[in-house]
Amino acid sequence: PEPPTACREKQYLINSQCCSLCQPGQKLVSDCTEFTETECLPCGESEFLDTWNRETHCHQHKYCDPNLGLRVQQKGTSETDTICTCEEGWHCTSEACESCVLHRSCSPGFGVKQIATGVSDTICEPCPVGFFSNVSSAFEKCHPWTSCETKDLVVQQAGTNKTDVVCGPQDRLRA
């Protein structure tokens, strides 16, 4: 028969014949021959291959290094890599999550718009008029100024984006 020039899906061409690829979780030991199908072996402990392949070595699972603030989010299998995330209070520096940095805090005058996760940093926003934040925090939103009127008080000192208003008693000497 004519040797093939292209092979079906999940096959590869070698020595003018189509051999089956190894399934995910297995590595190639020997190419197929006229007498035998492709020989594959399962990946070892802490190794994986996530595609149909002809790799002779499995990939090592990612190591979630606690010294870099990493921990295991999802344990790897023979077909999937380990997924790392960051310890509480930290987030990944990249999509690959190879290291972590401390969540950023929002300075006074800024509040938390979105709390940080293991993979994204804190998002801060400036406190708009009528709101303030007087602390540096990774959790606190901008708080609304105190409403002096609802307490039957008057504004003695105007609020800023960093300070609340100061309320005081009404001036009773006024007509």
């Epitope: 089956s20 030991v29 020997s30 197929c32 021959t33 006229e34 007498f35 035998t36 199908e37 020989e39 072996l41 002779t56």
Partner: antibody, heavy 113, light 108 residues
Framework: EVQLQQSGPELVKPGASVKIPCKAS????????MDWVKQSHGKSLEWIGD????????IYNQKFRGKATLTVDKSSSTAYMELRSLTSEDTAVYYC??????WGQGTLVTVSA | EIVLTQSPTTMAASPGEKITITCSAS???????LHWYQQKPGSSPKVLIY???NLASGVPVRFSGSGSGTSYSLTIGTMEAEDVATYYC?????????FGGGTKLEIK
């Protein structure tokens, strides 16, 4: 011409081990796996396992795990099969074969006290 | 493992007769990795047919093979005295590779 030369008959005692050589010639030794096959007297053929001389990885028939060990010596183009803890059940002719296309002449192993 | 069942286990045929030996697999054999071997007394097995229907080098054209999936056969177009031997089918599709029990062919 492809040739697989096996050693002569072996008479071994129960519990002992035996190492059977298979010297290959007429082709590039590392290009093909070497298979090993057992044939008990008057019986069919049983595949023991194979070894890839390129990476030294062996694959075994589960039935022969712990019984057979396959190795190669690339420098002399020789494949070996060691059989251990021999019993009368291991009395048979053992063949090496280059991926089943070419076969050695067989080595008779007789286990007897 | 794939179990290969050959039939008949023994048979006698006259010279010139057409012979068919069958090999039935317990599960499908991928890419037709089914082969036939001839073994004469005191000799090692010799490939006759590989990959179901391909004639091995130096094998007389009176030998042929066919089949697919789980059902395969070896045919000798016209039996000759030198064909007296035991014939084995073998699969190279999945580990452990397995052989049929053999068919012993004798002459009448």
């Amino acid at each position: 011409e492809v040739q697989l030369q096996q050693s002569g008959p072996e008479l071994v005692k129960p519990g002992a081990s035996v190492k059977i050589p298979c010297k290959a010639s007429g082709y590039t030794f590392t290009d093909y796996n070497m298979d090993w096959v057992k044939q008990s007297h008057g019986k069919s053929l049983e595949w023991i396992g194979d070894i890839n001389p390129n990476n030294d990885i062996s694959i075994y028939n589960q039935k022969f795990r712990g019984k057979a060990t396959l190795t190669v010596d690339k420098s002399s183009s020789t494949a070996y099969m060691e059989l251990r803890s021999l019993t009368s059940e291991d009395t048979a002719v053992y063949y090496c074969a280059r991926r089943f296309a070419y076969w050695g002449q067989g080595t008779l192993v007789t286990v007897s006290a | 493992e794939i179990v290969l069942t050959q039939s008949p286990t023994t048979m006698a045929a006259s010279p010139g007769e057409k012979i068919t030996i069958t090999c039935s697999a317990s599960s499908s054999i991928s890419s037709n990795y089914l082969h036939w071997y001839q073994q004469k007394p005191g000799s090692s097995p010799k490939v006759l047919i590989y990959r179901t229907s391909n004639l091995a080098s130096g094998v007389p054209v009176r030998f042929s093979g066919s089949g697919s999936g789980t059902s395969y056969s070896l045919t000798i177009g016209t039996m000759e005295a030198e064909d007296v031997a035991t014939y084995y089918c073998q699969q190279g599709s999945s580990i452990p590779y397995t052989f049929g029990g053999g068919t012993k062919l004798e002459i009448k």
